[in-house]
Interface confidence: medium
């Protein structure tokens, strides 16, 4: 196809390559999340870090374990979503199950869609393992009604 992306050199499976951004990632593709009047789209992201163990330290934001993991994850997301539309992340939560990470990503409206959020995150998994020693699996992305509006969107995950 005529347009390619430097960060998207090969296809592996659809879960890591769906709907790669069409113009360069400065204006990527699709968000089902409702938008605020300020023009922000939100996505809920969940993934497992299978090489870490959950313990009570991850329930206490003052612990070193919590803060180091939060810092690594925050830094990782700044690396993954370098394009101008990424506004940041919030509401990081850690859950049992190795370590399950849940967080909310914010993007400028119209700059990315849920599939590209997932695509770019999946494509970073290898680098996450080498750079941060985080083995990531079970990635799930969905649109979020924020701030907690009634209905997210009409895309029904199976």
């Amino acid at each position: 196809t005529p347009t390619t992306l430097a960060s998207h050199s090969t296809k592996t499976d659809a879960s890591s390559t769906h709907h790669s951004s069409v113009p360069p990632l400065t204006s990527s593709n699709h968000s089902t999340s409702p938008q605020l009047s300020t023009g922000v789209s939100f996505f809920f992201l969940s993934f497992h870090i299978s090489n870490l163990q959950f313990n009570s330290s991850l329930e206490d934001p003052s612990t070193d374990y919590y803060q180091e993991l939060q810092r690594d994850i925050s830094e990782m997301f700044l690396q993954i979503y370098k394009q101008g539309g990424f506004l940041g992340l919030s509401n990081i939560k850690f859950r049992p199950g190795s370590v399950v990470v849940q967080l909310t990503l914010a993007f400028r409206e119209g700059t990315i869609n849920v599939h590209d959020v997932e695509t770019q995150f999946n494509q970073y998994k290898t680098e996450a393992a080498s750079r941060y020693n985080l083995t990531i699996s079970d990635v799930s992305v969905s649109d979020v009604p924020f701030p907690f509006s009634a209905q997210s969107g009409a895309g029904v995950p199976g």
Epitope: A14, V22, H30, T32, E109
Partner: antibody, heavy 119, light 107 residues
Framework: QVQLQQPGAELVKPGASEKLSCKAS????????MHWVKQRPGQGLEWIGE????????YYNENFKTKATLTVDKYSSSASMQLRSLTSEDSAVYYC????????????WGQGTTLTVSS | NIVMTQSPKSMSMSVGERVTLTCKAS??????VSWYQQKPEQSPKLLIY???NRYTGVPNRFTGSGSATDFTLTISSVQAEDLADYYC?????????FGGGTKLEIK
């Protein structure tokens, strides 16, 4: 060259279920999400849903959530759509379509299966 | 659901004329708009993706433009073989939706 092969036509009775098939060739089946699109006679296009062949993950149009079930068979590079409780409203051409490399659109289309629901 | 509104519903043009089809989204869809051509008794074919990227093998007389809510497909010099229905579609927000189509007839 990517090809999506679909049966030309199916005739079923009201109230029955029908499974439509789509066989892919010419590309790595698991690399591209597969979509299904409905077109009633003389009408426009309606997206039913999509399935990720690599892990079976699906997204549905809410309007079809109770009507359609999407599945894939990685080994035969085939996608299927089961339609249930068929009525005359379901008479339409059903297309399978798939992504292309770095394309957020339906790059490849099957020829479509004409489903006729009639007693 | 995002509504894609196409205009005009139909048009009749002479060979060599410039054709402009428009598509308006009910919400911001970024550049996640594709254009499809469907000739009589055929499957749709992808012409333009990402609002302005011409798909492989599509003649360069077809040009897409626009972003956010307003999109245009232009055929710089229409040919007899361009007789078809043209649909825009968005892949920004679930469910993916299409416009109602524009029927292009050749005089």
């Amino acid at each position: 060259q990517v090809q999506l092969q679909q049966p030309g036509a199916e005739l079923v009775k009201p109230g029955a279920s029908e499974k439509l098939s789509c066989k892919a060739s010419g590309h790595t089946f698991t690399s591209y999400w597969m979509h299904w699109v409905k077109q009633r006679p003389g009408q426009g296009l309606e997206w039913i849903g999509e399935i990720n062949p690599s892990n079976g993950r699906t997204y549905y149009n809410e309007n079809f959530k109770t009507k359609a079930t999407l599945t894939v068979d990685k080994y035969s590079s085939s996608a299927s759509m089961q339609l249930r409780s068929l009525t005359s409203e379901d008479s339409a051409v059903y297309y399978c379509a798939s992504d292309g490399d770095y394309v957020s659109g339906f790059a490849y289309w099957g020829q479509g299966t004409t489903l006729t629901v009639s007693s | 659901n995002i509504v894609m509104t196409q205009s005009p519903k139909s048009m009749s043009m002479s060979v060599g004329e410039r054709v402009t089809l428009t598509c308006k989204a009910s919400e911001n869809v970024g550049t996640y708009v594709s254009w499809y051509q469907q000739k009589p008794e055929q499957s749709p074919k992808l012409l333009i993706y990402g609002a302005s990227n011409r798909y492989t093998g599509v003649p360069n007389r077809f040009t897409g433009s626009g972003s956010a809510t307003d999109f245009t497909l232009t055929i710089s010099s229409v040919q007899a073989e361009d007789l078809a229905d043209y649909y825009c579609g968005q892949s920004y927000s679930y469910p993916w939706t299409f416009g109602g189509g524009t029927k292009l007839e050749i005089k």
